[in-house]
């Protein structure tokens, strides 16, 4: 059985999937539908770097760029840096500056939704 | 404004190779993925791949996966697409197409490849 | 792989009448979370290359006249020309983009009556 053919017997069980799951998917050569994607739990995708949502969608990643201000896809591009937003070769913005560093700090997050960064 | 320029008209015998250009120009050549179509005479249109400028990633419809190979020179803003083991059935005008978020939003005029004993 | 059936094959229609265009995918192509269908419908005059018209299945390029117009979502769409001009003859294809390989229909001829 191919990734895609995998994909497709087991799409109806992702939407509660945890990240550790989807880091494992990731590698199964699976090329995940946008769609699908998107009712991923938030806290689930925010986790993933850019590499792992690459090999997680595959020919799919390239939707991004026309969903990017939709949730989760919005929030997932906040907390990425912007140098492996551009490996991606989609034109998306509002990565986090390359020279900053990123704290995570739970409590600040909880409460503005977005990573707390440092200045270069 | 954009422009997609392809390299110009073949003929192949079977079993042979061709590799089409497609010069794109007018836009940032890294921020938009480029797909490659085609069209048999009369007929309609077959996705065939789409590339990654800036990683060179590429993913081709299975349909063409052991014979197609895509890829891009960033330095003079150019994707190709080669196809191997050429037959009669691959005579077709192919086209890149620029990316505008997953639909085609600029085509190249398009290369008439003719595959002929 | 999501089979695209456009219908009609051709059509004739009179300078100034409608012309109406349906594709019909095997599987929805609708986003429920962003609610974008990801269709898109192509224009194709003769001897030429492609051009958009329409994406997310009713959103018209910029430059396309407001004549043309898409509508529909999951599985059913259409292309509506509400008013032919001469300049419309083409073939005119849907494509959906929802997952690879991305796929079209088999072109509808939009001809003068």
């Known amino acids: 059985m191919n990734g895609s053919e995998y994909f497709v017997k087991i799409q109806s069980f992702l939407g509660g999937a945890p990240t550790e799951d989807l880091k494992a998917l990731s590698q199964q050569n699976v090329s995940m539908d946008l769609a699908t994607f998107m009712k991923l739990r938030t806290d689930a995708v925010l986790p993933l770097t850019v590499a792992e949502v690459q090999k997680l969608l595959g020919p799919h990643v390239e939707g991004l760029k026309a969903e990017e201000r939709h949730r989760p896809v919005r929030d997932w591009i906040l907390r990425q840096r912007q140098d492996d937003l551009d490996t991606l070769g989609l034109g998306l913005q509002g990565g986090i500056p390359n020279g900053y560093l990123v704290l995570d700090l739970s409590m600040q997050e909880a409460l503005s939704g977005t990573p707390c960064l440092l200045g270069p | 404004e954009v422009q997609l320029v392809q390299s110009g008209a073949e003929v192949k015998k079977p079993g042979a190779s061709v590799k089409v250009s497609c010069k794109a120009s007018g836009y940032t050549f890294t921020n938009y993925w480029m797909h490659w179509v085609r069209q048999a005479p009369g007929q309609g249109l077959e996705w065939m791949g789409n590339i990654n400028p800036s990683s060179g990633d590429s993913y081709y419809n299975e349909r063409f996966m052991s014979r197609v190979t895509m890829t891009v020179d960033k330095s003079t803003s150019t994707a190709y697409m080669e196809l191997s083991s050429l037959r009669s059935e691959d005579t077709a005008v192919y086209y890149c197409a620029r990316s505008g978020g997953l639909w085609l939003a600029f085509w190249g005029q398009g290369t008439l490849v003719t595959v002929s004993s | 792989d999501i089979v695209m059936t456009q219908s009609p094959d051709s059509l004739a229609v009179s300078l100034g009448e409608r012309a109406t265009i349906n594709c019909k995918s095997s599987?929805?192509?609708?986003?429920?979370?962003?609610?974008?269908?990801?269709l898109a419908w192509y224009q194709q005059k003769p001897g030429q290359s492609p051009t958009l018209l329409i994406y997310?299945?009713?959103t018209r390029e910029s430059g396309v006249p407001d004549r043309f117009s898409g509508s529909g979502s999951g599985t059913d769409f259409t292309l509506t020309i509400s008013s032919l001009q001469a300049e419309d003859v083409a073939v005119y294809y849907c494509?959906?983009?929802?997952?690879?390989?991305?796929?079209f229909g088999g072109g509808t001829k939009v001809e003068i009556k």
């Open positions: 599987q929805t192509l609708l986003n429920s979370v962003s609610q974008n269908n990801y």
């Open positions: 494509q959906q983009h929802y997952r690879t390989p991305y796929t």
């Open positions: 997310f299945a009713s």
